[in-house]
Interface confidence: low
């Protein structure tokens, strides 16, 4: 997170830290005791699927305070439409090997109903993004969990206000822009997969996933987030279905 | 709708403006007051737009030049007071007033619903947690706010 602040311990209780072979991989969001939402691109280069760990209740990576809960990732489900190395359909649903125990420091973020997300949450201007990613473009990653308040843009406004880059990916209907184009604040590498959380009448909801951008906090560019509302039914259907074998699964979308 | 104007100076008004066409200046002479002249002139020059009683559901009408304004009773709204305010209680309008989820129903009022781990209160719009750790709440902040002294 560039230009954010430390999320006080326990105030981002749905934040997940994903590790592979003990190394920091990505962020994620707990949506109930056994399921985590993250970004598909986080898993493009994974070879040791059985060494994926999700950590809940984490705050400061440099110390163990007893509130952390680690779980093996039993399954990573990615939409069939996602192509590794690209930006569209950048979402993954992770099944934990064992459920986490909900505590003051481990709480799920609500996965909203689609219509509510599209016609109400999408019009809440500011939302929080969080993670242990880089504090500057090409800089060091954070030890303490960072959080940033970002305004959401309509895609048309995002395109109009963004500097044109030749090979820049399209902003599709499965994404949205949020943040600042003045180079001051943005999510960054290492935050990928983490939550874009929107507050409405006392409750927080998952509205986006940290996905991609032109560098981090680059002048003339906004952060791009996976539009979770497009995947609500897909996620719910998968969470209801019988477990399928295999760590990495491609599930038909839509 | 504007009969009160005719009570002001019946003789002059009949003579100058009803029997033959009068000008704004002649009307001004009759009423001696700019505001009253204007009210009369709006109705006189382009007809009384309130004559057809366009305001429904007990609304009162005010004539305007080529137009009119309805003043509605509290339960109604719309150009002609034709819409019952409850009919505007639909999900696209401020989430239908619901705290969480909203469902529209044809012929009946919208209904509010709550996420798993919450239940709907008697007011029909608010949600209250039914589990210790409902989604989307931050326990540390909830407890901090609950322990704050309450104003009296």
């Amino acid at each position: 997170i560039v230009g954010g602040k430390v999320c006080p311990k326990g105030e981002c209780p749905w934040q997940v830290l994903l590790l592979v072979n003990g190394a920091q991989l990505c962020g994620g969001t707990l949506i109930n005791t056994i399921w985590v939402v993250s970004a598909a691109h986080c898993f493009d280069k994974i070879k040791n699927w059985r060494n994926l760990i999700a950590v809940l209740g984490e705050h400061d990576l440099s110390e163990h305070d007893g509130d952390e809960q680690s779980r093996r990732v039993a399954q990573v489900i990615i939409p069939s439409t996602y192509v590794p190395g690209t930006t569209n359909h950048d979402i993954a649903l992770l099944r934990l090997h064992q459920p986490v125990v909900l505590t003051d420091h481990v709480v799920p973020l609500c996965l909203p109903e689609r219509t509510f997300s599209e016609r109400t949450l999408a019009f809440v201007r500011f939302s929080l993004v969080s993670g242990w990613g880089q504090l500057l473009d090409r800089g060091a990653t954070a030890l303490e969990l960072m959080v940033l308040n970002v305004p959401r843009l309509m895609t048309q406004d995002c395109l109009q206000q963004s500097r044109k880059v030749g090979d820049s990916p399209n902003i599709t209907e499965y994404m949205f822009c949020a943040g600042y184009s003045d180079g001051s604040k943005d999510s960054c590498k290492g935050d990928s997969g983490g939550p874009h959380a929107t507050h409405y009448r006392g409750t927080w909801y998952l509205t986006g996933i940290v996905s991609w951008g032109q560098g981090c906090a680059t002048v003339g560019h906004f952060g791009v987030y996976t539009r979770v509302s497009q995947y609500i039914e897909w996620l719910q259907k998968l969470m209801r279905s019988e477990p399928r074998p295999g760590v990495l699964l491609r599930a038909p979308f839509p | 709708a504007n009969a009160f104007l005719e009570e002001l100076r019946p003789g002059s008004l009949e003579r100058e403006c009803k029997e033959e066409q009068c000008s704004f200046e002649e009307a001004r002479e009759i009423f001696k007051d700019a505001e009253r002249t204007k009210l009369f002139w709006i109705s006189y020059s382009d007809g009384d737009q309130c004559a057809s009683s366009p305001c429904q559901n007990g609304g009162s009408c005010k004539d305007q030049l080529q137009s009119y304004i309805c003043f509605c009773l509290p339960a109604f709204e719309g150009r002609n007071c034709e819409t019952h305010k409850d009919d505007q209680l639909i999900c696209v309008n401020e989430n239908g007033g619901c705290e969480q989820y909203c469902s529209d129903h044809t012929g009946t009022k919208r209904s509010c619903r709550c996420h798993e781990g919450y239940s709907l209160l008697a007011d029909g719009v608010s949600c209250t947690p039914t589990v210790e750790y409902p989604c989307g709440k931050i326990p540390i902040l909830e407890k901090r706010n609950a322990s704050k002294p309450q104003g009296r």
């Epitope: 699927w49 069939s80 074998p245 699964l249 491609r250 038909p252 | -």
Partner: antibody, heavy 122, light 107 residues
Framework: QVQLQESGPGLVKPSQTLSLTCTVS?????????WSWIRQPPGKGLEWIGY???????NYNPSLKSRVTISVDTSKNQFSLKLSSVTAADTAVYYC???????????????WGQGTSVTVSS | EIVLTQSPATLSLSPGERATLSCRAS??????LHWYQQKPGQAPRLLIK???QPATGIPARFSGSGSGTDFTLTISSLEPEDFAVYYC?????????FGQGTKLEIK
């Protein structure tokens, strides 16, 4: 390089149990993947019999389910097929196979044994 | 179960020609369709996975397309070694099923 090799009797009497073993080399059977059995009657198409996943879970073709058992012996890096109450209709070339572990659930079969011919006859 | 119907049953072409093989699913299977080539006395070989992704080591003349219920395997310019039987496979839901095959023979 992953290699699979089927072994077992080439002739089985009707009503008996057909038993085949697949030995996997160049890859640990317990590390991932679905390990399948597929058969092909003479001059006909391919029929999926079932698989065992590295975790031990199995999935069988409903048309054969009542007669099929697939098991794994991780110590020998082998998995086996047992098909009971065989008839002449079970005469086929039997292939053992490993599904491509690109994304696990679609069972694109990237590795095959060379096949073993089994005839059911008295 | 998902039934895959391949057409034509037999396709007679000459080397250098373009071959187009069709596979139709009885219900939508997204892109969960794979293509195999089988030569006499040999095990099948995976050509295309997920409708359009070439398997490792497959020549560029083989390509796949389609999604949902209609799928096509195209061989842009036939080589002598391409004459074989081609099968499509449903990888979408159990039981896993194969098409009945298309035999590609030399004209």
């Amino acid at each position: 390089q992953v290699q699979l090799q089927e072994s077992g009797p080439g002739l089985v009497k009707p009503s008996q149990t057909l038993s085949l073993t697949c030995t996997v080399s160049g890859y640990s059977i317990s590390s991932d993947s679905a390990w399948s059995w597929i058969r092909q009657p003479p001059g006909k198409g391919l029929e999926w019999i079932g698989y065992i996943y590295y975790s031990g879970s199995t999935n069988y073709n409903p048309s054969l389910k009542s007669r099929v058992t697939i098991s794994v012996d991780t110590s020998k890096n082998q998995f086996s097929l047992k098909l009971s109450s065989v008839t002449a209709a079970d005469t086929a070339v039997y292939y053992c196979a490993r599904s491509v572990n690109y994304y696990g659930n679609s069972f694109a079969v990237g590795y095959w044994g060379q096949g073993t011919s089994v005839t059911v006859s008295s | 179960e998902i039934v895959l119907t391949q057409s034509p049953a037999t396709l007679s072409l000459s080397p250098g020609e373009r071959a187009t093989l069709s596979c139709r699913a009885s219900q939508g299977i997204s892109d969960y369709l794979h293509w195999y080539q089988q030569k006499p006395g040999q095990a099948p070989r995976l050509l295309i996975k997920y409708a359009s992704q070439p398997a490792t080591g497959i020549p560029a003349r083989f390509s796949g397309s389609g999604s949902g219920t209609d799928f096509t395997l195209t061989i842009s310019s036939l080589e002598p070694e391409d004459f074989a039987v081609y099968y499509c496979q449903n990888g979408h839901s159990f039981p896993l099923t194969f098409g009945q095959g298309t035999k590609l023979e030399i004209k």
